[in-house]
């Protein structure tokens, strides 16, 4: 079952998916000057059996010959301030993401594919939050939000973790980190805030794979 | 309570344009995706996609992409579907109804009939 | 794009009537939910995630199944009940209905 809504936003806090569950679509979007192969599926899926997961149909773009007519939604100039671009390392490489079942890894890239990936989750998968470079993550809890369905609305849980101005950026699940104690600490208003826009990830992988460099971009 | 109000009915001419509203009101139109559904006469539900109204980001049904557009202004609580160069064929009952998951409301329906 | 078939097209039925309505997938999906239409009028949640009654809906509408198969079942129609029932799915994109199926009067 698709999430009708978009997991929380935090403030100078990006987050990504480990592994997708499956049921989660990735649209097939490709950079200006390119379209998608008229017969090319607009998503990929993540569907699999009980033993393995994969992503089924594959995006492919093609030059457009004639003016591209594909609808794009262009931010603001106000909605331009809000990207980030944060360097995360993680000790999590691409290439040994450990193959949770039921779950499909990060699909590679494709030719000519746009800079930012939009995902659609599904009930149940989790996601995970990262202060950006040159904040401190205070914890009150899990730093993850797990899409839920209740009579038939889903929702994302609120997750619990803070961003403070501090140099160290904090690191991903299952990475040392120092844990604070806040709490004496109100939630701000701004962690609160549930965005209801689609979170589009644009990823760079270093050749050394040990570096995600994320933009995100609430449209 | 929740109320999605629709504009009224419209007539056009092939290969003109139509732009039907939908009014929220009773909850936080930035907290829901508005989806908008097509019954042509005699015939089935159809989703053609939906507008998160907070950025105005849209999915669309492929089958739709390139006929309809959806848009939303925040400082109305309003979501709009633009139909473009009209047929007979999209003749039709056109239905904005609120997400977040299955949709517990619905507008009451706008009727564009196109005919020359 | 996930399939919905609903079987019958159209149900000729009397009140007290027990009445049961299919719906199939093409692929296996999460949940159903079932809308019913009346002429004239949006369509109004009936049941959602396959089994759950939506608020002021009556005990006598029930849902069932799993996968690819799924039972809308009302179990002893009323006066009320005569109208077109919808299935739905929204496990994946582009969101499907089933082509409806009309309960009238025999």
């Known amino acids: 079952e698709l999430c009708d809504d978009d997991p929380p936003k935090i403030t100078h806090a990006t987050f990504k998916a480990v592994a997708y569950k499956e049921g989660t679509m990735l649209n097939c979007e490709c950079k200006r000057g390119f379209r998608r192969i008229k017969s090319g599926s607009p998503y990929m899926l993540c569907t699999g059996n009980s033993s393995h997961s994969s992503w089924d149909n594959q995006c492919q773009c093609t030059s457009s010959a004639a003016r591209n007519t594909t609808k794009q939604v262009t931010p603001q100039p106000e909605e331009q301030k809000e990207r980030k671009t944060t360097e995360m390392q993680s000790q999590m490489q691409l290439a040994d993401q450990v193959s949770l079942p039921g779950h499909c890894r990060e699909p590679p890239p494709w030719e000519n594919e746009a800079t930012e990936r939009i995902y659609h989750f599904v009930v149940g998968q989790t996601v995970y939050y990262q202060c950006v470079q040159g904040y401190r993550a205070l914890h009150r809890g899990p730093a993850e939000s797990v899409c839920k369905m209740t009579h038939g609305k889903t929702r994302w849980t609120q997750p619990q973790l803070i961003c403070t101005g501090e140099t160290e950026p904090s690191q991903f699940p299952g990475e040392e980190e120092p844990q604070a104690s806040p709490d004496g600490l109100p939630e701000s208003e701004t962690s609160r805030l549930v965005t209801t826009t689609d979170f589009r990830i644009q990823t760079e992988v270093a050749a050394t794979m040990e570096t995600f460099i994320f933009t995100t971009e609430y449209q | 309570q929740v109320q999605l109000v629709q504009s009224g009915a419209e007539v056009k001419k092939p290969g003109s344009s139509v732009k039907v509203s939908c009014k929220a009101s009773?909850?936080?139109?930035?907290?829901?995706?508005m989806h908008w559904v097509r019954q042509a006469p005699g015939q089935g539900l159809e989703w053609m996609g939906y507008?998160?109204?907070?950025?105005?980001?849209?999915e669309y049904n492929q089958k739709f992409k390139d006929k309809a557009t959806i848009t939303a202004d925040e400082s109305t609580n309003t979501a709009y579907m633009e139909l473009s160069s009209l047929r007979s064929e999209d003749t039709a009952v056109y239905y904005c109804?609120?997400?977040?998951?299955?949709?517990?409301?619905w507008g009451q329906g706008t009727l564009v009939t196109v005919s020359s | 794009d996930i399939q919905m078939t609903q079987s019958p097209s159209t149900l000729s039925a009397s009140v007290g009537d027990r009445v049961t309505i299919t719906c199939s997938a093409s692929?296996?999906?999460?949940?159903m939910h079932w809308y019913q239409q009346k002429p004239g009028k949006a369509p109004k949640l009936l049941i959602y995630?396959?089994?759950e009654l939506a608020s002021g809906v009556p005990a006598r509408f029930s849902g069932s199944g799993s996968g690819t198969e799924f039972t809308l079942t009302i179990s002893s129609l009323q006066p009320d009940d005569f109208a077109t029932y919808y299935c739905?799915?929204?496990?994946?994109?582009?969101?499907?209905f089933g082509q409806g199926t009309k309960v009238e009067v025999k």
């Open positions: 109804a609120r997400g977040g998951g299955v949709f517990d409301y």
């Open positions: 009773g909850y936080t139109f930035t907290s829901y995706r």
């Open positions: 507008i998160k109204p907070s950025r105005g980001y849209t």
């Open positions: 692929s296996s999906i999460s949940y």
């Open positions: 995630t396959t089994s």
């Open positions: 739905h799915q929204r496990s994946t994109y582009p969101l499907t």
